[in-house]
C-alpha cells in the first residue's frame, strides 16, 4: 500500500516521490532500505534527497533497489517505500513493457498524450516527442506544455509515444525519456459482462514457503474504451488495502488492447516471503464493470522442493 514502483534508464535523471504523504509533513528522511544508511541531502551527491523527492542525477543500474522514506511530523511518522529499477539503455528502438507507463486513449475530440512523471522535474520547453522512435513532424502534431496534441486522430496514430525533456538542477542538464502507449478509441466499441482470462476458477497455485509469489488477475470487458472497468484482488473477502498484511500488495499491470480490439486489464498480486498462513487464505480475482461482477477464486498450495538425492536413487 505504501510502496511504489519507479523506473528509469541509466545516465538519465530519475526523480521519485515518497509514496507516503504527510498530513502535514515537516521533514522527510530517506534511507537505503537494505543498509538503513541515510541518503544525503547535499546536492553535490549524485543520489540525494530533497524533501519528498529522491533524485538520481543521473541514475545508474546499481541504484536499483528499495528506498525508505520517513515523513516526520510532531504527531506521527509515516513510512513509505520506493522500489526503484534502473535499466540499461536499449540499443534497438523497441521499448520493453517494463519501461512503459500507463496506456492512454484518444479520439477525434480528445487526443492529448501527457508526458508521464514530468511534473516531478524542473524542465523547460520544448518537449520532444517520438512515435515508435521516429521524431514527430508535421502540423498535425503540437507539443503543448507537458502534453502532445494530435489533430484529426486516425487509427494509424496508435503506437508508443516517447517524450524527451531536459531536467535542470543547479545549472546542470540531464536528459529524461518516458514512453506510453496511445490507443485510438473505436467509436463502435461495446461493453460485455467481464470475462476473466486468468486465473481459472478454483485454480490451485503452487508456491514455495519463503519465496515470493505473483498471482495475475486478468479480465476483458469488451471492445474500445470502457466507461467503467476494474480488476482487483481480495483476501478472504477483504480489500487488499484493508487486509493489513504489508507483504501482500497488488499492483496494476499493463492495460491491454489486443489485436482483436478487446479491452483488458491486469492486476498482479505480489506475495513476499510466502508464509504457511498464506496457504489458508482465499484469494479472489474480481472483475467488474457496469454489467456486473465476476469472481474467480484461487488457493495456494505448498510446492515441495525437489529432493535432488531421490533423483539418483
Amino acid at each position: 500500500k505504501f510502496s511504489k514502483q519507479s523506473w528509469g534508464l541509466e545516465n538519465e535523471a530519475l526523480i521519485v516521490r515518497c509514496p507516503r504523504q504527510g498530513k502535514p509533513s515537516y521533514t522527510v528522511d530517506w534511507y537505503y532500505s537494505q543498509t538503513n544508511k541515510s541518503i544525503p541531502t547535499q546536492e553535490r551527491n549524485r543520489v540525494f534527497a530533497s524533501g519528498q523527492l529522491l533524485k538520481f542525477l543521473p541514475a545508474a543500474v546499481a541504484d536499483s533497489g528499495i528506498y525508505t522514506c520517513i515523513v516526520r511530523s510532531p504527531t506521527f511518522n509515516r513510512t513509505g517505500y520506493a522500489n526503484v529499477t534502473i535499466y540499461k539503455k536499449q540499443s534497438d528502438c523497441n521499448v520493453p513493457d517494463y519501461l512503459m507507463y500507463s496506456t492512454v486513449s484518444g479520439s477525434e475530440k480528445n487526443s492529448k498524450i501527457y508526458c508521464p512523471t514530468i511534473d516531478l522535474y524542473n524542465w523547460t520547453a520544448p518537449l520532444e516527442w517520438f512515435k515508435n522512435c521516429q521524431a514527430l513532424q508535421g502540423s498535425r502534431y503540437r507539443a503543448h506544455k507537458s502534453f502532445l496534441v494530435i489533430d484529426n486522430v486516425m487509427t494509424e496514430d496508435a503506437g508508443d509515444y516517447t517524450c524527451k525533456f531536459i531536467h535542470n538542477e543547479n545549472g546542470a542538464n540531464y536528459s529524461v525519456t518516458a514512453t506510453r502507449s496511445f490507443t485510438v478509441k473505436d467509436e463502435q466499441g461495446f461493453s460485455l459482462f467481464p470475462v476473466i482470462g486468468a486465473p481459472a476458477q478454483n485454480e490451485i497455485k503452487e508456491v514455495e514457503i519463503g519465496k515470493n509469489a505473483n498471482l495475475t488477475c486478468s479480465a476483458c470487458f469488451g471492445k474500445g474504451t470502457q466507461f467503467l472497468a476494474a480488476v482487483l484482488w481480495q483476501l478472504n473477502g477483504t480489500k487488499i488495502t484493508d487486509f493489513g498484511e504489508p507483504r501482500i500488495q497488488q499492483e496494476e499491470g499493463q492495460n491491454q488492447s489486443f489485436s482483436n480490439g478487446l479491452a483488458c486489464l491486469d492486476m498482479v498480486l505480489r506475495i513476499a516471503d510466502v508464509k504457511e498462513e498464506d496457504l489458508l487464505l482465499q484469494y479472489d480475482c474480481l472483475a467488474l464493470n457496469l454489467h456486473g461482477l465476476r469472481r474467480h477464486t484461487v488457493r495456494l498450495s505448498r510446492k515441495n522442493p525437489i529432493d535432488h538425492h531421490s533423483i539418483y536413487c
Epitope: 498530513k23 502535514p24 515537516y26 521533514t27 510532531p74 504527531t75 506521527f76 509515516r78
Partner: antibody
C-alpha cells in the same frame, strides 16, 4: 466543500463516559489527521489528542491520557472522541479539527457542548 | 510544554484602527526545516475557531489582506491594519512545533 459535523450537546453525571462523533465530508477522510480540542466556558483552547484515520495511530496530551480515547471509522468517514471518568471541570465545548498537507487545525467542527452535572 | 503568552488579554478599538496583538513562546518555534510553526486563529462567540495565519506569515484561504503576522523565533505580532466591524472577536496564537500543541490564552478585541 470540507465539512465536519459533530453530534449534539450532552449532559452527563460525574464518573460517566461521553462519546462524541465527528462526520467528515468534502475530502478524503484518510488523507487528514483528526484532532480534538477542548474549550471550557470562558476559557482558552486546549489540545487533547489526534488520530491518523489511515492507520488508526493515536497520540494524546498528558493531561487527558488514560481518560480519552480517539477512534475513527473509515467506512463512514467518522471520528470519535470518548472521555471517561467525567468531572465537573470537563464541562466544555469539544471541537474536532482536521489537518491538511500544509498545516494542522485547518477545518473545524461546530463544537459539542458537554455538561457534567450531578 | 511550550507556553504561549498573549498580550493584552483584551483591548478596545474603533473601526478603522490599526490593532496589534503580541504573542510570546517559551521556546523558539523555528524548525530545522526553516519554517516557524506559529499560527493565529479568530473565534467569534458561539462559533468554532477559524484559521487566519499559518506558519508565521501565510494568510489562510479567504482571509483578508488587512491581517498580517510577523516575528522571530519567540516573539510574534498579529496586525489588523484597518479594523472592520466583522473583526471584533477573540484571537489566539498557537504553536504546532511539538506536542502537546498549545494555544495562547486569547486576546479579546472589543468595540470602543
Amino acid at each position: 466543500q470540507v465539512q465536519l459535523v459533530q453530534s449534539g450537546a450532552k449532559v452527563k453525571k460525574p464518573g460517566a463516559t461521553v462519546k462524541i462523533s465527528c462526520k467528515a465530508s468534502g475530502y478524503i477522510f484518510i488523507d487528514s489527521e483528526m484532532h480534538w480540542v477542548q474549550q471550557a466556558p470562558g476559557k482558552g483552547l486546549e489540545w487533547m489528542g489526534a488520530i491518523d484515520p489511515e492507520t488508526g495511530d493515536t497520540v494524546y496530551a498528558k493531561k487527558f491520557k488514560g481518560r480519552v480515547t480517539i477512534t475513527a471509522d473509515k467506512s463512514s468517514s467518522t471520528a470519535y472522541m470518548e472521555l471517561s471518568s467525567l468531572r465537573s471541570e470537563d464541562t466544555a465545548v469539544y471541537y474536532c479539527t482536521g489537518s491538511t498537507t500544509d498545516y494542522y487545525f485547518a477545518y473545524w467542527g461546530q463544537g459539542t457542548l458537554v455538561t457534567v452535572s450531578s | 510544554d511550550i507556553q504561549m503568552t498573549q498580550s493584552p488579554s483584551s483591548l478596545s478599538a474603533s473601526v478603522g484602527d490599526r490593532v496589534t496583538i503580541t504573542c510570546r513562546s517559551s521556546k523558539s518555534l523555528l524548525h530545522s526545516n526553516g519554517i516557524i510553526y506559529l499560527y493565529w486563529y479568530q473565534q467569534k462567540p458561539g462559533k468554532a475557531p477559524k484559521l487566519l495565519i499559518y506558519q508565521l506569515s501565510n494568510l489562510a484561504s479567504g482571509v483578508p489582506s488587512r491581517f498580517s503576522s510577523s516575528g522571530s523565533g519567540t516573539d510574534f505580532t498579529l496586525t489588523i491594519s484597518s479594523l472592520q466591524p466583522e473583526d471584533f472577536a477573540t484571537y489566539y496564537c498557537a504553536q504546532n512545533l511539538e506536542l502537546p500543541f498549545t494555544f495562547g490564552q486569547g486576546t479579546k478585541v472589543e468595540i470602543k
